[in-house]
């Protein structure tokens, strides 16, 4: 079996963590977030070939069925396996508040 | 905001649970599973338009960035939110064994 972390599609094409630079405007947050003004958003992007970072048995099944009928069953998808928390300074009716979000920035990725 | 469960793309086109009929051969299990001979595999298939079954804040961010740069950031992806367990009767060196798998059949779906 192939090493689950070696990408057969070529450098950088398989499921991995990417960083995308975004402003509050880009994120649609300008009206309710004060800070940070810009965010390094970490997200999971890339293809999920056979055996690559398979999250579970379901991903394995999905890949096998995708190979049989790809117009019906899509390939597994690159999604966060876990998240890093992030603190936002938000506008409130009375002023500002600090809020921690646990599901905002991807920490690592797998294929489901 | 749109209702998170109303599909704007037309009936059945958005992220939802599908059942795919599969044999042990289809799944690549013929050499190690005895029963069941056929499986009704439940999996998550369909598009993830804006606000549809968004799993978390990350999905919301991903959708916003996808709209800004679709060639860089893919749309959120339809994946299992939870799983149903399934028992397989497996071949072993000494005979057979019953094994429960908790991550095999999707129970419900969301967009990440």
């Amino acid at each position: 079996a192939r090493n689950g972390d070696r990408c057969p599609l070529g450098p950088g094409r398989c499921c991995r963590l990417h960083t995308v630079h975004a402003s509050l405007e880009d994120l649609g947050w300008a009206d309710w977030v004060l800070s940070p003004r810009e965010v390094q958003v970490t997200m999971c992007i890339g293809a999920c070939p056979s055996q690559f970072r398979e999250a579970n048995m379901h991903a394995q099944i999905k890949m096998n069925l995708h190979r049989l009928k790809p117009d019906t069953v899509p390939a597994p998808c690159c999604v966060p396996a876990s998240y890093n928390p992030m603190v936002l300074i938000q506008k409130t009716d009375t002023g500002v508040s600090l809020q921690t979000y646990d599901d905002l920035l991807a920490k690592d990725c797998h294929c489901v | 905001a749109r209702n998170g469960d109303r599909c704007p793309l037309g009936p059945g086109r958005c992220c939802r649970l599908h059942t795919v009929h599969a044999s042990l051969e289809d799944l690549g299990w013929a050499d190690w599973v005895l029963s069941p001979r056929e499986v009704q595999v439940t999996m998550c298939i369909g598009a993830c338009p804006s606000q549809f079954r968004e799993a978390n804040m990350h999905a919301q961010i991903k959708m916003n960035l996808h709209r800004l740069k679709p060639d860089t950031v893919p749309a959120p992806c339809c994946v299992p939110a939870s799983y149903n367990p399934m028992v397989l009767i497996q071949k072993t060196d000494t005979g057979v064994s019953l094994q429960t798998y908790d991550d095999l059949l999707a129970k419900d779906c969301h967009c990440v």
Partner: antibody, heavy 121, light 106 residues
């Protein structure tokens, strides 16, 4: 640019076997699935099977199980199809065609020029 | 396996005419793909996923359909369109092709 090179023709005897080649260039060989398709004279297209060069996974049309065997040599970016126990029914043009399994739904996007196999004594 | 039936088998048209060829599936499929093949050449992808034109295909071509019925349409046929056109599905295993429609230009 992507190219799939196949030899033009093969003349073979009944009962023997033949190994057809398809040399790929212009892309990462392990990133595309490789299909093989049969076309008999003045007839339509018939899918034989596919191989995923990334892990040697194969699946075959039931009609060709036992007839065709698909393999790859990743070091030379070449796909092969061996056809066994040849009869006149196997006389046809055989195409290899690459397919991006990770951009579905898609078509078989690049095709070789085809190898014409003639089975004759 | 899913059987794809193409009609008509042979289609004769004059330059400038609108042409429609159909592909019917024995069971419902999610998408249809189309290939063009000229004599002595290999098939070329022409339309993928029902309605998307492959690279380099003229805009006079279009594709449509759903379920069991799909069509390839040429709004104004030209001499260079003379060829065989094959439909193909891969919603179900194994992938299958239609028998083809041969387009002749008068």
């Amino acid at each position: 640019q992507v190219q799939l090179q196949q030899p033009g023709a093969e003349l073979v005897r009944p009962g023997t076997s033949v190994k057809l080649s398809c040399k790929a260039s212009g892309y990462t060989f392990t990133s595309y699935w490789m299909h093989w398709v049969k076309q008999r004279p003045r007839q339509g297209l018939e899918w034989i099977g596919l191989i995923d060069p990334s892990d040697n996974y194969t699946n075959y049309n039931q009609n060709f199980k036992g007839k065709a065997t698909l393999t790859v040599d990743t070091s030379s970016s070449t796909a092969y199809m061996q056809l066994g126990s040849l009869t006149s029914e196997d006389s046809a043009v055989y195409y290899c065609a690459s397919y991006d399994g990770y951009s579905t739904p898609s078509a078989m996007d690049y095709w070789g020029q085809g190898t014409s196999v003639t089975v004759s004594s | 396996q899913i059987v794809l039936s193409q009609s008509p088998a042979i289609l004769s048209a004059s330059p400038g005419e609108k042409v429609t060829m159909t592909c019917r599936a024995s069971s419902s499929v999610n998408y249809m793909h189309w290939y063009q093949q000229k004599p002595g050449s290999s098939p070329k992808p022409w339309i993928y996923a029902t309605s998307n034109l492959a690279s380099g295909v003229p805009a006079r071509f279009s594709g449509s359909g759903s379920g069991t019925s799909y069509s390839l349409i040429i709004s104004r046929v030209e001499a260079e369109d003379a060829a065989a056109y094959y439909c193909q599905q891969w919603s179900s295993y194994p992938p299958t092709f239609g028998g083809g429609t041969k387009l002749e230009i008068k």
